[in-house]
């Protein structure tokens, strides 16, 4: 017992005065606490504790049970103990079952010992299995042997205590060891789509998927900037130990345009937390945006290609797409395909592919787009430019030499005069009246320019060019005069 | 050996609230799973919610969640569960039972706390 | 959620006869399927677990088998004590238990 000097309060002193005792099951326990001052004595095994406030410690018939610690205390709070096994062959381990571990913990497998002086006190596993090669305990017969570090991968290990009690091993109850796991990452998070967009009264759902080693990860959806509680539905699945799913779908039955924004799915353990975020869009009504790929206004020669491309954005789905020439519908040199193949995707592509064009083919073709909302087109003017044509040179009756052409861009009409046999006509020669035909015809397809110039003007003989050209080419017809005397004997045109 | 100890029997107005307790006598509470689950008069048993204490958040049933609170308690080993919003179909065995998240089985039950909602 | 479906909702049988108690899951919980017994005022008592693990102190007439979405309860001999009913229960999704199949005395 304690010794302590005078005038200082001394714990208690026990009878018998030993650490230890040992008691035959069917004996008599008897303890004494010599104290003036005591208060009680307490009886702890398995975590299960008795009082009694006599100062005498009596049981007639000792049971494995009352195998434990006896502690008395006195009014200072001082206290002594002693230890006592009450030995039962039949009953060599106190058991409580239940056997939880925290990973990377000890966990304590609770088998005290009813008799000390067995021997090989150790664990051992069910149905005469190894335990794994990993697994360290240490044994104490006052408590039960506790298990190091313990791992996940001891998760459902079935085991019992073991001892040597006169030559025969003695088994316990089975326990069956259940690991708590550690985090040791953030939750992993995803969401179903990172963006959505409604009309006004139609339903958001979006589902958030958590995945963990436990079901107790934290998790819920909230909306950015706002403490109001979204309702949200769970499902949840374990696909193995330590493999935990969740979805959590959130829900708005019937959006509305204020509903828009950022939604976010968070997630958190005792490691730390992960969060996704997906957008809401909500829009009154559905709409179409288009945007032409190349200019409107579209110039080209004539026999070439040209491909009018777009780009529309249309929500919801468009349903209807159409090219349109002179009110006539394109079956086919069209397509019209997704921008992405992605889920929410809104953009489209449309393309129409006019090949060799002609100079008749000018005009206005027109892409025409709707959905269940709304109705766009886009209208492309396109102009073929064509090399000047020469459709009529004549010698009018009033002396007048005419040269009409038709070309796009607008032609010009120059006139030469060549003396002579000379090929080459340098002298020009001003034009009496030039104007344009078709100026208000349509506003598409080649442009008809007429220019007239006086032959009285011609004194010698030669030829008179006409040439008409624009941007793209040129193209000459020729009058060639003849004098016999003093007339005019001939005029002959030719290009 | 572990024991659940249940509070007493509880008679309630619909609307009201009950809170039940469950208190673990011995062996490793933090680490335990305790889960509540009820059982109306003459029906089968119905899982509400857990939870582990080490880990601190709990776990619900999707037809409680939002009215079901659970909670635990490690410095008195006890675990709680707190019903609102109270209506007659509320009426039943309410149990605690060790075991029931994480794949753990129901090995150890307390003995049921008896909640009559009448107006 | 997952259902647990329970055949037959009870049976009549007599000392000694050999039971079996049926459960269907709705879809596949692996072996994350455990069987319990209750008796009329008092609290559910743990059988099985992991769908044929017996529970220590159960008596070995018990046994489960079973794994995916279709298991059974065997009571080779039935005794007095095992007239009672009989719940089985998921542990994969939120958990569920069958609607109980009531034993009783023939």
């Known amino acids: 017992q304690p010794s302590v000097s005078p005038g200082e309060p001394s714990p208690p002193s026990i009878h018998p005065a030993k650490s230890e005792l040992i008691v035959r099951v069917g004996n008599e326990i008897r303890l004494l606490c010599i104290d003036p001052g005591f208060v009680k004595w307490t009886f702890e095994i398995l975590d299960e504790t008795n009082e009694n406030k006599q100062n005498e410690w009596i049981t007639e018939k000792a049971e494995a049970t009352n195998t434990g610690k006896y502690t008395c205390t006195n009014k200072h709070g001082l206290s002594s103990s002693i230890y006592v096994f009450v030995r039962d062959p039949a009953k060599l381990f106190l058991v409580d079952r239940s056997l939880y571990g925290k990973e990377d913990n000890d966990t304590l497998v609770r088998c005290p010992l009813t008799d000390p002086e067995v021997t090989s006190y150790s664990l051992k596993g069910c149905q005469g299995k190894p335990l794994p090669k990993d697994l360290r305990f240490v044994p104490d017969p006052k408590a039960g042997i506790t298990i190091k570090s313990v791992k996940r991968a001891y998760h459902r290990l079935c085991l019992h205590c073991s001892a040597d009690q006169e030559g025969k091993s003695v088994l316990s109850d089975k326990f069956i060891l259940k690991v708590r796991p550690a985090f040791k990452a953030v939750p992993v998070v995803s969401v179903s789509k990172a963006s959505y967009l409604l009309r006004e009264g139609e339903e958001f759902t979006v589902t958030c998927t958590i995945k963990d080693v436990s079901s107790s990860v934290y998790s819920t959806w909230k909306r950015e900037n706002s403490q109001t509680k979204l309702q949200e539905k769970y499902n949840s699945w374990h696909h193995g130990d330590f493999n935990y799913e969740r979805q959590a779908t959130l829900t708005i039955s019937s959006a509305r345009v204020n509903d828009s924004g950022v939604f976010m799915c968070y997630a958190n353990n005792t490691f730390g937390s992960a969060n996704v975020t997906t957008t809401l869009e909500v829009v009154d009504k559905g709409f179409i945006n288009i945007f032409p790929m190349i200019n409107t206004t579209v110039f080209v020669n004539d026999g070439e290609n040209v491909d009018l491309i777009v780009e529309y954005e249309a929500f919801p789905k468009p349903e209807h797409q159409q090219w349109i020439y002179m009110n006539r519908t394109f079956t086919d040199k069209w397509e019209d395909y997704p921008k992405s193949e992605n889920e929410s995707n809104i953009r489209y592509v449309s393309e129409l592919h006019l090949t060799r064009l002609k100079g008749t083919e000018g005009g206005t073709y027109t892409f025409l787009v709707s959905n269940s909302d709304v109705n766009a087109s886009i209208a492309f003017n396109v102009y073929v430019n064509t090399k000047p044509e020469i459709l009529t040179y004549d010698r009018l009756v009033n002396g007048m030499l005419q040269c009409v052409a038709a070309g796009f861009p607008e032609p010009t009409i120059d006139w030469y005069f060549c003396p002579g046999t000379e090929q080459r006509c340098s002298a020009s020669v001003l034009p009496v009246d030039v104007q344009t035909l078709n100026a208000s015809g349509p506003p598409f397809g080649k442009l008809v320019v007429q220019s007239s110039i006086d032959s009285s003007a011609f004194k010698h003989n030669g030829t008179v060019e006409c040439k008409a050209y624009n941007d793209v080419g040129k193209t000459s017809a020729y009058f060639n005069f003849a004098f016999k005397g003093n007339n005019k004997e001939q005029i002959h045109p030719h290009t | 050996q572990v024991q659940l100890v249940q509070s007493g029997a509880e008679v309630k107005k619909p609307g009201s609230s009950v809170k039940v307790s469950c208190k673990a006598s011995?062996?490793?509470?933090?680490?335990?799973?305790i889960s509540w689950v009820r059982q109306a008069p003459g029906q089968g048993l119905e899982w509400m919610g857990g939870i582990i204490p080490i880990f601190g958040t709990a776990n619900y049933a999707q037809k409680f969640q939002g009215r079901v609170t659970i909670t635990a308690d490690e410095s008195t080993s006890t675990a709680y569960m707190e019903l609102s919003s109270l209506r007659s179909e509320d009426t039943a065995v309410y149990y605690c039972a060790r075991g029931g998240l994480d794949t753990d089985e129901f090995d150890l039950w307390g003995r049921g706390t008896l909640v009559t909602v009448s107006s | 959620d997952i259902q647990m479906t329970q055949s037959p909702s009870s049976l009549s049988a007599s000392v000694g006869d050999r039971v079996t108690i049926t459960c269907r899951a709705s879809q596949s919980i692996n072996s994350y399927l455990n069987w319990y017994q209750q008796k009329p005022g008092k609290a559910p008592k743990l059988l099985i677990y992991a769908a044929s693990s017996l529970q220590s102190g159960v008596p070995s007439r018990f046994s489960g088998s079973g794994s995916g979405t279709d298991f059974t309860l065997t009571i080779s001999s039935l005794q007095p004590e095992d007239f009672a009913t009989y719940y089985c229960?998921?542990?994969?999704?939120?958990?569920?238990f069958g609607g109980g199949t009531k034993v009783e005395i023939k």
């Open positions: 011995g062996g490793t509470f933090s680490s335990y799973a």
């Open positions: 229960q998921q542990g994969v999704s939120d958990i569920t």
